[in-house]
């Protein structure tokens, strides 16, 4: 049937992790997550 790829983010660059539905770029040190990204390898909204 085909299935989920191995559980790691296939995104260019560092600091991507799965948050919610998608692999997202994490927030910089000293910031916190307001909302996760809405597309693969996208940017989270950070505050």
């Amino acid at each position: 049937q085909g299935g989920t790829r191995s559980p790691r983010c296939d995104c260019a660059g560092d600091f991507h992790k799965k948050i919610g539905l998608f692999c997202c770029r994490g927030c910089p040190a000293g910031h916190y997550l307001k909302a996760p990204c809405t597309e693969p390898c996208g940017n989270s909204t950070c505050l």
Epitope: G3, K18, A35, E39, P40
Partner: antibody, heavy 123, light 107 residues
Amino acid sequence: EVQLVESGGDLVMPGGSLKLSCAASGFIFSSYGLSWIRQTPDKRLEWVATISGGDSYTYYPDSVKGRFTISSDNAKNTLYLQMTSLKSEDTAMYYCATQREIYYGTYYALDHWGQGTSVTVSS
Amino acid sequence: DIQMTQTTSSLSASLGDRVTISCRASQDINNYLNWYQQKPDGTVKLLIYYTSRLQSGVPSRFSGSGSGTDYSLTISSLEQDDIATYFCQQGSPLPWTFGGGTKLEIK
């Protein structure tokens, strides 16, 4: 066997509120992502809301953001959609569906759907 | 937002015919394309995901193909049970979007 049974649909006045429920069985509810999809009177399908499996992040299109809230109760195996400030354009059949993660953190398909519950917004 | 377009809203065919339903995306969707069948009673079922992979339990007369922005669903030999409306959907960036549907009828 996966089963999804929606309820709570009704006739409501513009500006009113309504809470839909989706009772789920046949799978590990807490680890599955779930969505609400609606079908408008002209038969178009529109994504309405999603809650991710495990970490329970929520997502909405701009058309319902700030008015609709998706939530779940793992103890009751039930998904909810709280709808407020309802408009005539929210009139639709509302379906809940499970989302299957095809590729990790990338791509999903809606692999099981309920039978739907009808919402009519009219004065 | 990615727009999904099914140019044919209704299609009439005879039992046993080979039927193809098309879907176009407003941008490249990397084969992240799903097909759903909605029966006249409103029941919705996933048929195909990732352009061409058959969902468990779906008859092998259904197949999917395409790439980039253009995709299609084919029924190799139409059966009475296939009378339904078929929707395509892109399942990657939000908002997830659907085509307008193609209603399949018997000639």
